[in-house]
């Protein structure tokens, strides 16, 4: 079975300093799947951030950058200039 494992349970972030979130795929090559990122905020709303092929949710393209680290089998989400409004729980997911 494949598994997507977040590299950190908690990521302390400084305002304005780029932050990187990573998910490691276990049991399969990440290149065989499309990676998606979501953010859950208060009220348990799950908001779409990014999907491979450079697809971003509304309002996310300017401050978020999704990538795949093929060599390390990682999905990567970079928050370019974090602010308080970026607080929340981030989830990676995959599909074919």
């Amino acid at each position: 079975a494949i598994e997507l494992v977040p590299e950190h349970q908690t990521v302390p972030v400084s305002i304005g300093v780029p932050a990187t979130l990573r998910c490691s795929m276990k049991g399969e090559a990440i290149g065989n799947y499309y990676i998606n990122w979501y953010r859950k905020t208060q009220g348990n709303t799950m908001t779409f951030i990014y999907r491979e092929k450079d697809i971003y949710g509304p309002g996310f393209k300017d401050n978020f950058q999704g990538d795949i680290d093929i060599a390390k089998n990682l999905a990567v989400l970079k928050i370019l200039a974090p602010s308080e409004r970026d607080e929340g729980s981030y989830y990676c997911a995959c599909d074919t």
Partner: antibody, heavy 118, light 113 residues
Framework: EVQLVQSGAEVKKPGASVKVSCKAS????????LHWVRQAPGQGLEWVGW????????DYAQTFQGRVTMTRDTSISTAYMELSRLRSDDTAVYYC???????????WGQGTLVTVSS | DIVMTQSPDSLAVSLGERATINCKSS????????????LGWYQQKPGQPPKLLIY???TRESGVPDRFSGSGSGTDFTLTISSLQAEDVAVYFC?????????FGQGTKVDIK
């Protein structure tokens, strides 16, 4: 300002081990992979391996498997590379470099010259 | 392992002229899902560590002068210095980060003619 400061030059005999340190500052040490790359005198660049300072996970080039060990001390934001069973062709400048993006080396240490000679 | 081969090994160019360095990978470093080439370029001056110039084959690192540009896709890549300056005298390396082990080209030495 991101800085990687390495330990000083070493002279070792064949068969010995060397341990090089790399102290990081100016960024979150546990947030980014740290690599070691070496360069023999007048030669090109050769990737040795990486360490994930957060988890301690490592991956080494096949060439160095069994001879290299990468470790870190997160309390002092320092990474270490130990190379054992040294040979004369291990004489090189060893660089640490961090990877703030994906796969490329954004910042480099000043390099540590390791000379292996009898 | 992916083998990176640069050409030429060295070149001499007049100040203000164009310098072109080629890099060929033994297999493609293009990932079709994101259409990105996992290739970088570095500059190394004597006695100094390498400095990142370009990543994703064509994206300039911040602070790098715009006379440096990268192009190419798949297995064939080029670093171009549009108007060579005295401070550009250095050795230039390409590097693939598509698969482990990461590998570098052998380097191209750029001098002033």
């Amino acid at each position: 300002e991101v800085q990687l400061v390495q330990s000083g030059a070493e002279v070792k005999k064949p068969g010995a081990s060397v341990k090089v340190s790399c102290k990081a500052s100016g960024y979150t040490f546990t947030g980014y992979y740290l690599h070691w790359v070496r360069q023999a005198p007048g030669q090109g660049l050769e990737w040795v391996g990486w360490i994930n300072p957060s988890s301690g996970d490592t991956d080494y080039a096949q060439t160095f498997q069994g001879r290299v060990t990468m470790t870190r001390d997160t309390s002092i934001s320092t990474a270490y590379m130990e190379l054992s069973r040294l040979r004369s062709d291990d004489t090189a400048v060893y660089y640490c470099a961090n990877e703030l993006g994906i796969g490329v080396f954004d910042y480099w240490g000043q390099g540590t010259l390791v000379t292996v000679s009898s | 392992d992916i083998v990176m081969t640069q050409s030429p090994d060295s070149l001499a160019v007049s100040l203000g002229e164009r310098a072109t360095i080629n890099c060929k990978s033994s297999q493609s470093v293009l990932y079709s899902s994101n259409n990105k080439n996992y290739l970088g370029w570095y500059q190394q001056k004597p006695g100094q560590p390498p400095k990142l110039l370009i990543y994703w084959a064509s994206t300039r690192e911040s602070g790098v002068p715009d006379r440096f540009s990268g192009s190419g896709s798949g297995t064939d890549f080029t670093l171009t210095i549009s108007s060579l300056q005295a401070e550009d005298v250095a050795v230039y390396f390409c590097q693939q980060y598509y698969s482990i082990p990461y590998t570098f080209g052998q380097g191209t030495k750029v001098d002033i003619k």
